[in-house]
Amino acid sequence: YFGKLESKLSVIRNLNDQVLFIDQGNRPLFEDMTDSDCRDNAPRTIFIISMYKDSQPRGMAVTISVKCEKISTLSCENKIISFKEMNPPDNIKDTKSDIIFFQRSVPGHDNKMQFESSSYEGYFLACEKERDLFKLILKKEDELGDRSIMFTVQNED
């Protein structure tokens, strides 16, 4: 069971300091941006991180949403990352959900975050280069010190 708590607005970056944004095709991508670029590209660079109470404490349970015309929420259904047009629900009556991730700091580094899927144990949000694009993907990872699964989250509230 997950029960919604508060939400915050955040900018998410990979460890190469590229900014996560949602492009015109609703794809989550990373790109080099100055602070003014980041502001100019809002709301596509501003993510709503909603925290949830978890009936089985496993870290901070969150959803990641973005509000452009409508609110879309990050999903890892079938291990594929996509934004689905939906509001983060107030309650989820299950111990796993394709839209819930566990946000945890990397040990010894409070500013570096990992996001593990609640649906797929050992699968993490990651940044992966595909041709010329830096994509947000779900990655099965047993190399937990891999920088590709670490992010910084800067609160904008």
Epitope: P57, R58, G59, F102, R104, V106, P107, G108, H109, E116, E121, G122, K140, D142, E143, L144, G145, D146
Partner: antibody, heavy 126, light 107 residues
Framework: QVQLVQSGAEVKKPGASVKVSCKVS????????FHWVRRRPGKGLEWMGR????????KYAERFKDRVTMTEDTSTDTAYMELSSLRSEDTAVYYC???????????????????WGQGTLVTVSS | DIQMTQSPSSVSASVGDRVTITCLAS??????LTWYQQKPGKAPKLLIY???KLQDGVPSRFSGSGSGTDYTLTISSLQPEDFATYYC?????????FGQGTKLEIK
């Protein structure tokens, strides 16, 4: 309780290949990997590589990558490690081990080698 | 590759002694460090994971500490069954690397 049972000792000639098996008995959850580690006489533990039974993807240590092949048969819950072009320096005890997530009180994941096979002595001698 | 420098390579001690073994990583390994004990003719046995978390069934005289690049295994009061070889292992990045081992012998 998971147990790993390895195949028996082998004596091989230089240039030959050896294939060591590792059978899982007992209940094992999904989301684990098989790793192979060896210990040569008078030396320390040395990581050789790992295989993911879910998709058969492998990662090998650089010094073994041209000679080692790790495979897994999910129907029999058995992992295999084949080492080719054997030389006398490959004389060692070879271990299989499972690599699984353990979690701390906040749910943070840590991978550990928890269950180990009994070891297989491979002797390379002419 | 991440190098793990373990010291000392051997130590002689008596029952009841306090023993400390250290491992120094060549880069930050984020506490993704485990400690193993190995006795002759036996497979390694997990003692500590996550640098400081005691594996179930391991006596509380064993403890681990450290972060970043520096890690320590301490045995607070040596028992006869503790004489063995101890290894650290970094699990942060592939290739996984062990320390060279510390042989703990009876004085």
């Amino acid at each position: 309780q998971v147990q790993l049972v390895q195949s028996g000792a082998e004596v091989k000639k230089p240039g030959a290949s050896v294939k060591v098996s590792c059978k899982v008995s007992g209940e094992i959850s999904t989301g684990y990997y098989f790793h192979w580690v060896r210990r040569r006489p008078g030396k320390g533990l040395e990581w050789m590589g790992r295989i993911d039974p879910e998709d058969d993807s492998t990662k090998y240590a650089e010094r073994f990558k041209d000679r080692v092949t790790m495979t897994e048969d999910t129907s029999t819950d058995t992992a295999y490690m084949e080492l080719s072009s054997l030389r006398s320096e490959d004389t060692a005890v070879y271990y299989c081990t499972t690599w699984r997530i353990y979690r701390d009180s906040s749910g943070r994941p840590f991978y550990v080698m928890d269950a180990w096979g009994q070891g297989t002595l491979v002797t390379v001698s002419s | 590759d991440i190098q793990m420098t373990q010291s000392p390579s051997s130590v002689s001690a008596s029952v009841g002694d306090r023993v400390t073994i250290t491992c120094l990583a060549s880069e930050d390994i984020y506490t993704y460090l485990t400690w193993y004990q190995q006795k002759p003719g036996k497979a390694p046995k997990l003692l500590i994971y996550g640098a400081n978390k005691l594996q179930d069934g391991v006596p509380s005289r064993f403890s681990g500490s450290g972060s970043g690049t520096d890690y320590t295994l301490t045995i607070s009061s040596l028992q006869p069954e503790d004489f063995a070889t101890y290894y650290c292992l970094q699990g942060s990045k592939f290739p996984l690397t062990f320390g060279q081992g510390t042989k703990l012998e009876i004085k």
